[in-house]
């Protein structure tokens, strides 16, 4: 399938987004302009935007301006000057700032522990699918469906470090080699990114907020599937990781470490187990073809066990079957050996909510899904809101001058090695990339950090996780040392590898564009973020999978005209960009295939068509609910009262011309009165972060 | 104490089917062997088969394999023998007898033994 | 099957006398895990049969030390010093070495 039209507006020009850039950003026109730029990407940027009702002037924005969609917005101080404030004044705004930053404590808080639920949840509903996936006996031979599984698995279970722990147990077990475990490393990394993605799918609301954060999420899914897309290949054909790894570990005589600190679990658990308890090697034992453990539930019941150690005479088929000759005997009918059992007593139950349910593990997994998923939801739109009434003004400025601006020259270009570093401390730290890069997500969708600084800090989490996933293999028993460690350091070594191909060079930094593009897309249709992540974490995973059950030969015979036809496509989309004239006049542009393969338009009408109900029934009480229907229907005329979706009924009407947005003006809180949002008297009570 | 209660006699027509009890208390049911024996009147015994009530595993004589059923049920600490297709033969005094399997094979308790007499 | 002769069939005695029981076996009843699981057992009328020896001459706990087994292979003796009434009864030997476990056809103890 050709690209769409939009692609071809959606970055004019691709190396703005450098690194370099960063620091010295021009200042953005306001969210809603950028609203309405991606409203209608084919509108020519310089077209003078029509005047709201109650505006004075005609405003011309410059050209430059509203040329990248990208740039920070300004976040306007409305409020009253420090300096100017009286003492009553300051005493009031700093236990606001005070209590501003403990409701944002709280409400990070929970955000993280409702991650945890979260990656519990998808545990119970598929995490028993998951360990079946494992216990495929294709993986030691096709590395492909070693990828998928681990994508699969990974999205499933929402823990790579889970899907990893399997992994080594197996390898460790004999029942995988390292060489069948790398591709389902490569596809556990691929889908914990799946995580942050999710995270920025509950910015829908806002257009300009949306794409920042979808991209921002999406850089690291780019960067994962890129990764893959080269080190599968290099791996399957050097087996470099392997070799390296092994080299490794064969050339140090490790002792047993001590466990990996658990930092935030230490927080989070206190909480997060009084709502659900798992038992993880549930899961491991399905994948070891545990048969006991299918019927297992992964609800925790028991807390507290004694476990006996006692020999028990047990009958064996004959004499060669006795665990060793002296512990055989007969009694003349049967033959007999002694046999080590471990016998489980329970004495304390567990303390969490479903502990005396007895419901299905489905049930349970359900009911933590949805209401973890709300609670996530929840405190992203208070985090964002707090961040938001916080971050403006000197504040703005100065965080964002701090995290965006990079070092003088000649040093520039280490300031994105250092935030690779304070990203790999910061997963250190919070023991997990999901949840460090799922509180990158809003800041990026506010504007706190470009995406260009985001791509660096998301890298370093991936080798934070995995200098995690190192110390917890030190800390592993003697048996599964060996093989623990060097999965952990093939991981390692997987994605410095893809750091070295996509972010040395600017060039190469094809992820940032990638997800920039997506997120123009994602935000002028914002159905084809959740199709995007239906695709790209479900389907091909899936469909990959089924065609590798199948056999060789189908998957190479589907595969070799599918990868034929994307190879295809891309060298003429290069060539469409950078050399047209080598092309014959009717390749030169997309327009020889019919509108259905080449633009999102007609695909936007039938989805539209589908959740024509939705819109309808659309809910402007409940923000969350809200949301969740902007995401489906492009409503532009629900939520208004929400402020959460800001289509104007001109959008909808297909009005090329672009309506200045109230935004513009100097003061926000102007603005939110003319639309009736702010009631007037409250405009002056707006406190300027400390 | 150590004990091992049979079922009373039985008076059953030739042909029919008769099921005999063994109620054993005072010691761990599941650990010991549940043997059979046949005594015809005024002859000498003869070893029917026997039950592990632990893993419900038989051994029979194949003598008998076709005329009796070995069975045992651990929580009410009993074994069955059930007789089938009954002859005058088959008129007996049955014992069930605990087999000792540990160190040194023996049978050191039995039951009082029950009557089974089959006549038209 | 292992075919178990006792003699002599009967065994008239007086209380107080010395009593031989013998027990010949068809083949040898040495197991392969090299016991001799022979037996002796003494039934009592309208009683059901009780231990007397075990391993061919292992007494069971509470018999009189008046009861001694001897003999291995093939030939096997039970006896008896000092008959006394109590002793009166059916005697039967047991192999159970070979399957089918087999009894003797009995020596009835007497008295003169």
């Known amino acids: 399938m050709a690209p769409w039209p939009e692609l071809g507006d959606a970055q004019p020009n691709p190396d703005k987004y450098l690194e370099g850039a960063a620091g010295q950003q021009p200042t953005a026109p306001d969210k809603s302009k950028e609203t309405n730029k991606t409203d209608n990407t084919e509108a020519p940027v310089t077209k003078i935007e029509l005047l709201p009702s109650y505006s004075t002037a005609t405003l011309i924005d410059e050209p430059t301006e509203v040329d990248d969609p990208w740039n920070l917005p300004t976040l306007q101080d409305s409020g009253i000057k420090w300096s100017e404030r009286d003492t009553k004044g300051k005493i009031l705004c700093f236990f606001q700032g005070i209590g501003r930053l403990i409701l944002l404590l709280g409400f990070l808080y929970f955000f993280v522990c409702s991650l945890d639920i979260l990656s519990s949840a998808f545990q119970l509903v598929g995490g028993k699918m998951a360990g079946q996936f494992f216990s495929n006996s294709s993986i030691m031979s096709n590395p492909l469906l070693g990828l998928v599984i681990g994508v699969l698995v990974t999205v499933l279970v929402q823990s790579s470090s889970t899907s990893t722990s399997i992994v080594v147990s197996m390898v460790s077990s004999s029942l995988l080699t390292v060489r069948a475990a790398i591709p389902i490393i490569m596809g556990a990394n691929i889908g914990t990114s799946i995580t942050n993605t999710i995270v920025a799918l509950m910015q829908v609301g806002d257009r300009s907020e949306f794409r920042r954060a979808f991209a921002g999420a999406t850089v690291h899914d780019f960067f994962n599937w890129l990764s893959v897309l080269v080190l599968l290949p290099v791996e399957v054909a050097t087996h470099y990781l392997e070799i390296i790894t092994q080299l490794i570990v064969e050339s140090f005589h490790f002792k047993n470490g001590e466990d990996a600190p658990d930092l935030l679990k230490v927080i989070t658990k206190p909480f997060t187990k009084l709502i659900v308890q798992l038992d993880k090697k549930v899961i491991s034992q399905i994948a070891m073809n545990d048969e006991k453990a299918k019927n297992k539930s992964l609800v925790k019941i028991w807390c507290k066990t004694f476990t006996n150690k006692t020999q028990i005479n047990v009958t064996v088929p004959s004499t060669a079957n006795c665990t060793s000759p002296s512990l055989c005997w007969t009694d003349g009918i049967q033959n007999w050996t002694m046999k080590n059992v471990t016998y489980k007593e329970n004495i304390a139950k567990c303390q969490h909510i479903f502990v005396n349910f007895h419901l299905p593990d489905l049930a349970v997994g359900t009911i933590l899904l949805i209401l973890s998923l709300l609670v996530l939801c929840g405190c992203l739109i208070m985090i964002v809101k707090i961040l938001g009434s916080v971050l403006k003004g000197q504040v703005a400025t100065v965080i964002k001058k701090t995290i965006n601006t990079d070092f003088p020259f000649p040093f520039a270009w280490l300031t994105g090695y250092l935030a690779i570093l304070v990203g790999a401390g910061m997963t250190f730290i919070v023991q997990s990339s999901s949840v460090f890069t799922s509180a990158l997500t809003p800041l990026i969708g506010i504007g706190v950090i470009t995406i260009e600084r985001a791509y660096p800090l998301t890298l370093g989490s991936n080798i934070g996780t995995t200098t995690t996933a190192i110390l917890a293999a030190l800390a592993s028993p003697g048996n599964a040392l060996r093989s623990s460690l060097q999965i952990a350091l093939c991981h390692f070594f997987f994605n410095i590898s893809g750091i070295l191909l996509w972010y040395p060079i600017p060039f190469t930094r094809l992820p940032i564009r990638m997800a920039k593009g997506l997120g123009n897309i994602s935000a002028k249709y914002r159905w084809f973020a959740v199709f995007y992540l239906i695709i790209f974490f479900f389907l091909i995973p899936l469909t990959v999978f089924g065609l590798s059950l199948a056999g060789w030969r189908v998957l190479v015979g589907v595969g070799v005209p599918v990868v034929f036809i994307i190879i295809l496509v891309l060298c003429l989309r290069l060539l469409q960009s950078r050399c047209p004239r080598v092309l014959p006049k009717k390749l030169q542009n997309w327009n020889f295939l019919p509108l259905w393969m080449r633009s999102l338009k007609p695909w936007d009408a039938v989805v539209s068509k589908f959740t024509g109900c939705f819109q309808m029934r659309c809910c402007c009480c409940c923000r969350v609910c809200c949301r969740a229907c902007c995401l489906l229907c492009d409503c532009p005329k629900c939520c208004r009262c929400s402020k959460c979706c800001e289509d104007l009924e001109e959008a909808q009407e297909g009005q090329d011309v672009p309506v200045k947005a109230p935004e513009t003006f100097d003061n926000i809180t102007i603005s939110r009165e003319a639309q009736g949002e702010v009631p007037a008297s409250d405009s002056k009570t707006e406190c300027t972060a400390l | 104490q150590v004990h091992q209660q049979q079922s009373g006699p039985e008076l059953v027509k030739p042909g029919a089917s008769v099921r005999i009890s063994c109620k054993a208390s005072?010691?761990?049911?599941?650990?010991?062997?549940i043997h059979w024996v046949k005594q015809r009147p005024g002859q000498g015994l003869e070893w029917i088969g026997c039950?592990?009530?632990?893993?419900?595993?038989?051994k029979y004589n194949e003598k008998f394999k076709d005329k009796a059923t070995l069975t045992a049920d651990t929580s009410s600490t009993t074994a069955y023998m059930h007789l089938s297709s009954l002859t005058s033969e088959d008129s007996a005094v049955y014992f069930c007898?605990?087999?000792?399997?540990?160190?040194?094979?023996?049978?050191?308790?039995w039951g009082a033994g029950t009557t089974v007499s089959v006549s038209s | 099957d292992v075919l178990m002769t006792q003699t002599p069939l009967s065994l008239p005695v007086s209380l107080g006398d010395q009593a031989s029981i013998s027990c010949r076996s068809s083949?040898?009843?040495?197991?392969?895990?090299?016991?001799?699981?022979l037996e002796w057992y003494l039934q009592k009328p309208g009683q059901s049969p009780r231990l007397l020896i075990y391993?061919?001459?292992n007494r069971f706990s509470g018999v009189p030390d008046r009861f001694s087994g001897s003999g291995s292979g093939t030939d096997f003796t039970l006896k008896i010093t000092g008959v006394e009434a109590e002793d009166l009864g059916v005697y039967y030997c047991?192999?159970?070495?070979?399957?089918?476990?087999?009894f003797g056809g009995g020596t009835k103890l007497e008295i003169k």
């Open positions: 047991f192999q159970g070495s070979h399957f089918p476990w087999t």
């Open positions: 007898a605990r087999f000792l399997n540990w160190n040194a094979w023996y049978f050191d308790v």
């Open positions: 039950i592990y009530p632990g893993n419900l595993f038989t």
């Open positions: 005072g010691y761990t049911f599941t650990s010991y062997y």
């Open positions: 391993k061919v001459s």
């Open positions: 083949q040898s009843i040495e197991h392969s895990n090299g016991n001799t699981n």
